[in-house]
């Protein structure tokens, strides 16, 4: 018996087609992805093959103005239209709190939404009961297939699930649910979830009875043969894990942003054992036409987005200096504003010993692309912010050793004075540079804001300590020459859309007046630009 698994993960609000790098589509003939194009390919496969499941491994939420405006209603509407068979909850599904998950998505989805390792307690238990499930048995042709869901147990640090959801260890929670499926005589079981490739492989190895793992969260690109676009494969598709009980378990993921449709064919014997598995992600490029009816629906929903982007979010009473003459040479108040917004977006009081789990932010000055003039009645719109942050990135959470941070700050000024983008803007950090010293030895003071304290204060950076830092995904991926971050980071979790983070902060503050306040200093009276 053959099953075709179509899968997506980490789509992050890319409802419309995008450019090759998943930012805004400029030249339509070279654009990719989007739900209209995805629907064309899914329908083509459904017509050609008998037993097809379309699965999503979480993080549909968050990533573009679509989510900012529609808050998840767009996810339910278009996933229903595409007739997804099941979805696992990702960490970003909790970005607008539990209510922001229940009302737009859990209540409106026409397909099961799954997670076995999230347990509700207190008053939420009865409110959310039945709205998401640990597993679902799906009828496929004359057979049944069990889908068991899982979600990153780091979600309380990455999103806003509140205090009435407990995120258990994935493997511990999955095993009894898989065992339950076995007692129901379900002998073909897919683990569908959102905890990253390393956990996906562990689940394949450790959870007895799981036949296939379909994952997300780490945006992992797997491919067999010559890859069709810019993504470099982390391994073959499917990635085969030998389980502790000796079975070969295929593990798959389909990069992110709806650029690819994962396509995995599994052959089962009559006892539900996997005989063979093969496939590859399908690049959703312009050779696949966009479905006209879904496209028309997208265009109808789009209208509200254009109206939103010109509405006032809040006001500034000071000039927001995002000029390259400032942000690439010294502390600029636009950099301070953005970093303050980044920290504010990551306030999670999950431990009494810590005022917050993260206090530090770094931001490449080259990522700040425009100032905002306060002389326009102080008005700040989404459109204004999109000029400041035009690349459609995210502000991510990483864990780094102090020694890596020191290297990053040395890199920040290694060729100072050439208006290069690597000059770092900061939050929760005080840095002093001496430009008279040779490159690689210019950081003379680096103090960081404590987290395990009731009164936050600045302490010298410790080289061997592990620190959490919020930074643009561009830096986490080694951009602007920050190879040391990419190579040495200990953990990386994708965060919220950059513009959304700043716009939420401005809306919350109502009136802003960021200052230049001595976060970055130069000693030795060295002349600088």
């Amino acid at each position: 018996w053959e099953l075709t698994i179509l899968h997506t993960n980490d789509v992050h609000s890319r409802l419309e087609q995008t450019s090759e790098d998943s930012s805004k589509c400029v030249n339509a003939s070279r654009c990719m992805g989007g739900v209209a194009r995805l629907f064309t390919k899914v329908q083509q496969i459904r017509r050609a093959e008998p037993n097809v499941l379309l699965l999503d491994a979480g993080d549909q939420y968050q990533g573009t103005i679509w989510f900012t405006v529609y808050k998840g209603a767009e996810v339910a509407h278009f996933m229903n239209a595409l007739r997804y068979d099941a979805m696992a909850l990702g960490n970003h599904e909790f970005d607008n709190g539990v209510e922001g998950l229940i009302e737009p998505l859990l209540k409106e989805a026409k397909f099961p939404i799954l997670s076995a390792n999230i347990k509700a307690k207190g008053p939420l238990a009865s409110q959310i009961s039945g709205l998401y499930l640990p597993y679902k048995v799906l009828p496929v042709g004359d057979e049944v297939v069990g889908i068991v869901g899982y979600t990153s147990k780091e979600t309380p640090f990455l999103s806003n699930p509140g205090t009435n959801l407990v995120f258990e260890d994935e493997i511990t929670a999955l095993q009894p649910e898989v065992d339950k499926l076995k007692t129901l005589n379900v002998n073909k079981i897919i683990a569908l979830g959102h905890s990253g490739f390393e956990m996906d492989k562990l689940i394949a190895q450790k959870v007895r009875g799981v036949d296939v793992v379909v994952g997300g969260h780490s945006n992992t690109f797997l491919y067999t043969g010559n890859p069709p676009s810019k993504e470099v494969p982390a391994g073959k598709y499917p990635f085969i894990v030998t389980s502790d009980d000796g079975r070969k378990v295929p593990v798959v993921q389909a990069y992110a942003f709806g650029k690819y449709l994962g396509y995995l064919k599994i052959e089962f014997d009559e006892r539900g054992n996997v005989i063979s598995s093969h496939g590859n992600p399908i690049l959703l490029n312009s050779s696949i036409p966009e479905d006209p009816s879904i496209k028309a629906d997208i265009n109808k929903w789009r209208i509200k987005l254009d109206n939103y982007s010109t509405q006032e979010l809040g006001k500034t009473i000071v000039y927001l200096d995002g000029s390259s003459q400032s942000c690439r040479f010294r502390e600029c108040n636009m950099g301070n504003l953005i970093c303050d917004a980044m920290i504010n977006n990551n306030l999670r009081h999950t431990d009494e010993m810590f005022w917050n789990h993260v206090s530090m932010c770094i931001l490449n000055g080259g990522g700040i692309r425009s100032p905002i003039d306060e002389r326009n009645n102080g008005t700040i719109t989404w459109e204004n912010l999109a000029a400041v942050l035009p690349f459609g990135g995210t502000f991510d959470l990483v864990q780094l050793k102090g020694s890596t941070l020191k290297k990053a700050f040395e890199h920040s000024v290694h060729r100072y004075g050439q208006s290069t983008g690597e000059f770092l803007q900061v939050g929760g950090i005080h840095v002093v540079y001496d430009l008279s010293r040779k490159p690689g030895d210019r950081v003379v003071k680096l103090d960081v804001l404590c987290t395990k304290c009731r009164v936050p204060s600045y302490d010298p950076l410790k080289m061997d300590e592990v620190y959490k830092v919020i930074l643009p995904n561009f830096l986490a991926n080694g951009g602007d020459g920050f190879q040391m971050i990419k190579d040495e980071l200990l953990r990386h979790d994708s965060g919220d859309q950059d513009i959304n983070v700043v716009s939420t902060y401005i809306s919350k503050m109502k009136v802003i007046y960021p200052a230049v306040e001595g976060r970055i200093k130069f000693s030795h009276h060295h002349h600088h630009h």
């Epitope: 397909f111 009828p139 049944v144």
Partner: nanobody, 124 residues
Amino acid sequence: DVQLQASGGGLVQPGGSLRLSCVVSGFTLDYYTIGWFRQAPGKEREGVSCINSSGGVTNYADSVKGRFTISRDNAKNTVYLQMNSLKSEDTAVYYCAAQKYYYCSRKGEVYDSWGQGTQVTVSS
């Protein structure tokens, strides 16, 4: 919380009719496929009929085809099973079940929520 309550059972003579109702609460019926199942003493549970979430697809066991009709009234949050030309072998406890999914299936294991049963006895 998803709850289902089956009613309308009773004692009826062979050749007679009954209409079973399944009232659902705690969710929007529109998004759920509903199935009717029955279990006679000493026998395995049997999938009798189902109606998919859009109401456009129905399915019946061979043993009831042409005699039973399933329908849904989403405004009343109710699914009905009209049973005509009843036979003694239709005697059983009848249950309704719900699953949030598009497709109609008479396999019991695919349903997530179950109602209390209602007894149907066909006897002269």
